[in-house]
């Protein structure tokens, strides 16, 4: 058993049918010695008396808010949560496996640049009685500071019969140098509590590996005289690290017909312009990627050919 | 990814082309190592990230773009005290500063070259003959060093008398390649920045 926060405790259980569970001793936070009784949740049934209460915690029915009273007055509370260990592996019931970039990916994180700011998000089908708390650091043995905000519900989607909820959090490394070469990964830890179930999820990454630039901005077409060709131009996104001559991007320019089946023409360039043939009803799209470290491509910025 | 490679302009900062070749070569070598050594811990998540140049060179600091010298977090680990001197900050692109940056890059390349050659000698003794260093990568390191045109004492190749532990050598190769790729990215950024200046 360990303390998650004041008056909230997590009981770790080896989870299998007929498991013996864990013996837990609760102590009433009071100078009083006599006339103390214990109850669980809203029930008025007295579970025991005395300054300490010994319970065998086996199932969720044994978890909850234990309260010690004296003469109708509440003295203190202890909330017991359960953390299930199933065959040596901590349960992952609360969050959905996003399966990207690999199986057992519960937390996904992205950064728009090298400033040390990043966003993480996760999915769940649970809509109520759910709380999250996020901590982060650079390295784990001698951790350096990363400050995270509160996790917020950022999207709701319908998937088949189920509703899916997306939560996200923004974090900022306290003293980040964009040019630094990372040798210690960022660690992100999410505590999730659903009703009386506790779970924790972690992700470890280097900022360089989660970079996904914003799409190029100011995408424009300039028709070339007496030609089907057009000059496409764009700019670096505002959110990208500066100076751009140091933090350079490379670009992919795509000409896509109205039909998804039509052949796509693609050109790669390090410049912020390209000359392409503009077909009728086609659209031109441009996306960006770090020129020197191949992390994710940005989403496409698009303009119609007409 | 195989992208069309732009040929450098004749007037272009001469090292840029070599640094781009270096990054391409080390990235290819790392990819080959990860595939060949699939049963060894060779991915970024599995290895310890060690920097053999730590406390010996200060490339990131010496080559910091002028625009980032205002960032406290980029300055706090600098041993090169003159960088923080106001007059030097103002003339960041002076030949003195550039020389310091390029000599630091040269020292990095020299250290990695020695390590890679020593390692290759060990790998050639492996009866499994599982993996060797790409000669192209070693040649590209050499070309960039020549283009940088610094003279410094030659570091003797480390020779080891004891029987090599091939498992450890292959893991060390992975560690070295990961670190060198990161340094090659920094070198490429620096060359691009200097070329634009």
């Amino acid at each position: 058993i360990w303390e998650l926060k004041k008056d909230v405790y997590v009981v770790e259980l080896d989870w299998y049918p007929d498991a013996p569970g864990e013996m837990v001793v609760l102590t009433c936070d009071t100078p009083e010695e006599d006339g103390i009784t214990w109850t669980l949740d809203q029930s008025s049934e007295v579970l025991g008396s005395g300054k300490t209460l010994t319970i065998q915690v086996k199932e969720f029915g044994d978890a909850g808010q234990y309260t010690c009273h004296k003469g109708g007055e509440v003295l203190s509370h202890s909330l017991l949560l359960l953390h299930k260990k199933e065959d040596g592996i901590w349960s992952t019931d609360i969050l959905k496996d996003q399966k990207e970039p690999k199986n057992k990916t519960f937390l996904r994180c992205e950064a728009k640049n090298y400033s040390g700011r990043f966003t993480c998000w996760w999915l769940t089908t649970i809509s109520t009685d759910l709380t999250f708390s996020v901590k982060s650091s650079r390295g784990s043995s001698d951790p350096q500071g990363v400050t995270c905000g509160a996790a917020t519900l950022s999207a709701e989607r319908v998937r088949g019969d189920n509703k899916e909820y997306e939560y996200s959090v923004e974090c900022q490394e306290d003293s980040a140098c964009p040019a630094a070469e990372e040798s210690l990964p960022i660690e992100v830890m999410v505590d999730a509590v659903h009703k009386l179930k506790y779970e924790n999820y972690t992700s470890s990454f280097f900022i360089r590996d989660i970079i996904k630039p914003d799409p190029p901005k100011n995408l424009q077409l300039k028709p070339l005289k007496n030609s089907r060709q057009v000059e496409v131009s764009w700019e670096y996104p505002d959110t990208w690290s500066t100076p751009h001559s140091y933090f350079s991007l490379t670009f992919c320019v795509q000409v896509q017909g109205k039909s998804k089946r039509e052949k796509k023409d693609r050109v790669f360039t390090d410049k912020t312009s390209a000359t392409v043939i503009c077909r009728k009803n086609a659209s031109i799209s441009v996306r960006a990627q770090d020129r020197y470290y191949s992390s994710s491509w940005s989403e496409w910025a698009s303009v119609p050919c007409s | 990814r195989n992208l069309p490679v732009a040929t450098p302009d004749p007037g272009m900062f001469p090292c840029l082309h070599h640094s781009q070749n270096l990054l391409r070569a080390v990235s290819n070598m790392l990819q080959k190592a990860r595939q060949t050594l699939e049963f060894y811990p060779c991915t970024s998540e599995e290895i310890d990230h060690e920097d053999i140049t730590k406390d010996k060179t200060s490339t990131v600091e010496a080559c910091l773009p002028l625009e980032l010298t205002k960032n406290e977090s980029c300055l706090n680990s600098r041993e090169t005290s003159f960088i923080t001197n106001g007059s030097c900050l103002a003339s960041r692109k002076t030949s003195f500063m550039m020389a310091l940056c390029l000599s630091s890059i040269y020292e990095d390349l020299k250290m990695y070259q020695v390590e890679f050659k020593t390692m290759n000698a060990k790998l050639l003794m492996d009866p499994k003959r599982q993996i060797f260093l790409d000669q192209n990568m070693l040649a590209v390191i050499d070309e960039l060093m020549q283009a940088l045109n610094f003279n410094s004492e030659t570091v003797p190749q480390k020779s080891s008398l004891e029987e090599p532990d091939f498992y450890k050598t292959k893991i060390k190769l992975c560690i070295l390649l990961h670190a060198f790729r990161i340094r090659a990215v920094t070198i490429d950024r620096v060359m691009s920045y200097l070329n634009a200046s």
Partner: antibody, heavy 115, light 112 residues
Framework: QVQLVQSGGGVVQPGRSLRLSCAAS????????MHWVRQAPGKGLEWVAF????????YYADSVKGRFTISRDNSKNTLYLQMKSLRAEDTAVYYC????????WGQGTMVTVSS | SYVLTQPPSVSGTPGQRVTISCSGG????????VKWYQQLPGTAPKLLIY???QRPSGVPDRFSGSKSGTSASLAITGVQAEDEADYYC????????????FGTGTKVTVLG
């Protein structure tokens, strides 16, 4: 004590269907994940499928994906394996089993796919 | 396709020490716990070892398990005639959990 009693096995022709049941008692069935494991005659153990305690997630071996469906009725304390498009290579003793460090197995039920 | 490899058979005379190996990889045994089962002819498997080296109550202490790196082993010290059976190791893979990964199985024969 924990008990898992299996039923539903038998002889079936290739291409036909069969449903296996596993009745649980002696524990809170709705709190635990469940597996199906099979063993072809003279062969080793092969995992078939898993279902979460609440039925929200199901996992299958590639060899049965799209043909077999694992399900559970927590109100009846029963686990099921619906097998469709049966093949000769599905011939095996099928076991249900609880998920956890200490597990309990059903007695097994024989499924023979033969024309 | 079994990812956990066991020797097809091992044998020993009563009182001898018999060991069965189970070889895997970094993503299975290297990252997860190992279990061992005993299966007597015509019966369901019986758990002998969980959590690499833990014995459930009721399992004789002549059975012991261990794990090192990407391999595990089961030892029977002082093998007895009633130990003649098939033995299976089981683990999980990091990427496919909760799918059970079983070993190829080992037939233990007690001679004499």
């Amino acid at each position: 004590q924990v008990q898992l009693v299996q039923s539903g096995g038998g002889v079936v022709q290739p291409g036909r269907s069969l449903r296996l049941s596993c009745a649980a008692s002696g524990f809170t069935f709705s709190s635990y994940g469940m597996h199906w494991v099979r063993q072809a005659p003279g062969k080793g153990l092969e995992w078939v499928a898993f279902i979460r305690y609440d039925g929200s997630n199901k996992y299958y071996a590639d060899s049965v994906k799209g043909r077999f469906t694992i399900s559970r009725d927590n109100s009846k304390n029963t686990l099921y394996l619906q097998m469709k498009s049966l093949r000769a290579e599905d011939t095996a003793v099928y076991y249900c089993k609880t998920h956890g460090s200490h597990d309990n197995w059903g007695q097994g039920t024989m499924v023979t796919v033969s024309s | 396709s079994y990812v956990l490899t066991q020797p097809p058979s091992v044998s020993g005379t009563p009182g001898q020490r018999v060991t069965i190996s189970c070889s895997g990889g970094r993503s299975n045994i290297g990252s997860n716990c190992v279990k061992w089962y005993q299966q007597l002819p015509g019966t369901a498997p019986k758990l002998l070892i969980y959590g690499n080296d833990q014995r459930p109550s009721g399992v004789p202490d002549r059975f012991s398990g261990s794990k090192s790196g990407t391999s595990a082993s089961l030892a029977i010290t002082g093998v007895q005639a009633e130990d003649e059976a098939d033995y299976y190791c089981q683990s999980y893979d990091r990427g496919t959990h909760p799918a059970l990964l079983f070993g190829t199985g080992t037939k233990v024969t007690v001679l004499g």
